[in-house]
């Protein structure tokens, strides 16, 4: 035999102060004939929340038209929620009776509790830059949420990370909670354009997690590689020497040329280019005068990158006899 069921699908409903709460209740039968009322609590002390037929309930509206005789939706909305509204709400079916209606069946109840959304996660990286292959730590913090249950995930370029530790405070009962998580990330040489994301999921966010991001460009230093080469062709009595500084980050770089140990002050031509991975290349050209008395010239290209210790590359200039002859011929 079929019998009326009262369906209250949500066991727990988390609401925010000031917002409107929707309490769902549907029935599976129009029989027995009689009204559906809403109560908070159970037993003789229960509080009437809504009665369609009598009473004044200014904050309560029905979702459906209860005057429609074939209505099976008795859900209600309660506006301007305050902390005083917390409790368990029951929709209750009454059977039409004389002289008064008789309670027939109650729904299982929906507990209304106050929830608070977590703040936007803030991600902080290391204070100093680190080179690839090393591990750096990122912290993520979010505050002010309730209830305590919360999920935090870390991602690097969309890939979930597993090396992290998370704490939610306080451990006991509280009006609001905070979460702090520290993730350890191994830097790759191509991480200039990488991002770490901290994702926080909470019941109050209704499946739309909050995210905080940090760019690994703030945490990484990619040291340059140096190469000094002599151009095979000379221009008049000058030889062109190139210093190529490759794949470095950040851009901060000082380059100086030395000739036989003496720093050269004169202008040199140079170009800066950006690679697809976000690192930079710097090319500097140095023109050396060739003369009879300059048998052995040692050129040094020295680079100081991002305040680190200088690195240098030397080149002993090769001046052929033919080049010397040409140079002396050309000099009056």
């Amino acid at each position: 035999e079929e019998e009326l069921q009262m369906i209250q699908p949500e066991k727990l409903l988390l609401v925010t102060v000031g917002k409107t709460a929707t309490l769902h209740c549907t029935v599976t039968s129009l029989l027995p004939v009689g009204p559906v009322l809403w109560f908070r609590g159970v037993g003789p002390g229960r509080e009437l929340i809504y009665n369609q037929k009598e009473g004044h309930f200014p904050r309560v509206t029905t979702v459906s038209d209860l005057t429609k005789r074939n209505n099976m939706d008795f859900s209600i909305r309660i506006s301007s929620i305050t902390p005083a509204d917390v409790g368990t709400y029951y929709c209750v079916k009454f059977r039409k009776g004389s002289p008064e209606n008789v309670e027939f069946k109650s729904g299982p109840g929906t507990e209304m509790a106050l929830g608070a959304k977590p703040s936007a996660p803030v991600v902080l990286g290391p204070a100093a830059r680190t080179t690839p292959e090393h591990t750096v730590s990122f912290t993520c913090e979010s505050h002010g949420f309730s209830p305590r249950d919360i999920t935090l995930k870390w991602f690097k370029n969309g890939n979930e990370l597993s090396d992290f530790q998370t704490n939610v405070d306080p451990t006991g009962q509280s009006v609001a909670y905070s979460i702090r998580s520290t993730a350890r990330v191994v830097l790759d040489p191509w991480d200039v354009r990488s991002q770490v994301i901290c994702e926080v999921a909470h019941v109050t966010l209704q499946g739309d997690p909050l995210r905080g991001t940090a760019n690994l460009s703030e945490a990484i230093r990619v040291p340059p590689t140096l190469e000094v080469t002599q151009q095979p062709m000379r221009v008049g009595n000058q030889v062109n020497v190139t210093c190529q500084v490759r794949k470095f980050y950040p851009q901060s770089l000082q380059l100086t040329w030395s000739e036989n140990g003496n720093v050269c002050q004169r202008e040199t031509a140079s170009t800066l280019t950006e690679n697809k991975d976000g690192t930079y290349n710097w090319t500097s050209w140095f023109l050396v005068n060739i003369s009879d008395q300059r048998d052995d010239v040692v050129l040094t290209c020295q680079v100081k990158h991002d305040g680190q210790l200088a690195v240098s590359k030397r080149l002993a200039l090769e001046v052929t006899v033919h080049q010397k002859d040409q140079s002396s011929d050309a000099t009056p």
Partner: antibody, heavy 119, light 107 residues
Framework: QVQLQESGPGLVKPSQTLSLTCTVS??????GGWYWQWIRQHPGKGLE???????????FYNPSLKSRVTISVDTSKNQFSLKLSSVTAADTAVYYC???????????WGQGTTVTVSS | DIQMTQSPSSLSASVGDRVTITCQAS??????LNWYQQKPGKAPKLLIY???NLATGVPSRFSGSGSGTDFTFTISSLQPEDIATYYC?????????FGGGTKVEIK
Amino acid sequence: QVQLQESGPGLVKPSQTLSLTCTVSGGSISSGGWYWQWIRQHPGKGLEWIGTIYYSGSTFYNPSLKSRVTISVDTSKNQFSLKLSSVTAADTAVYYCAREGYHSGMDVWGQGTTVTVSS
Amino acid sequence: DIQMTQSPSSLSASVGDRVTITCQASQDISNYLNWYQQKPGKAPKLLIYDASNLATGVPSRFSGSGSGTDFTFTISSLQPEDIATYYCQQFAYLPWTFGGGTKVEIK
């Protein structure tokens, strides 16, 4: 005068999802009081109620299909839709959308659309 | 589910005859019952709602009665355009269920 028109593919492969849309013209789908229905009729057989969606958004489904059925409303397009997943040949039928009036009966129907489930 | 048993499953009558169809519910459904007419290749049409109320625009030769478990649908004077299949439908309990239908033909 309110009119209903079903639309969707006439042929669906087994295990796929059947998707039908019912467009309401001559009235607003979101105006209070109306309930929107899907009913089907197997070839040469009787009528089977699939489910209902209220203007409030509440849904009621036939338990025999509940695990496979979703009914939704798009008020901006004045449409409501039926999705039936994991279809088999047994889902071959004429599918009707209908409006349940203020009193109770389904007073406005679409003309019906035939859906065949076959590979 | 509530079972709706309709009888007869088919009948043949002459124009002008009084035609009666019955519908029995497997349990008490009060007066939560509708009657529909379906012509071949067409969608059903609501004739009677709440067991005995005539739907808008429906000729008065159609009527319905009953409450609880036993319901009757009557065509007082059969017309040629009444050739169709007639269905009862209960909406007291979910899922809503239809009777198996009664096919009405002209002799």
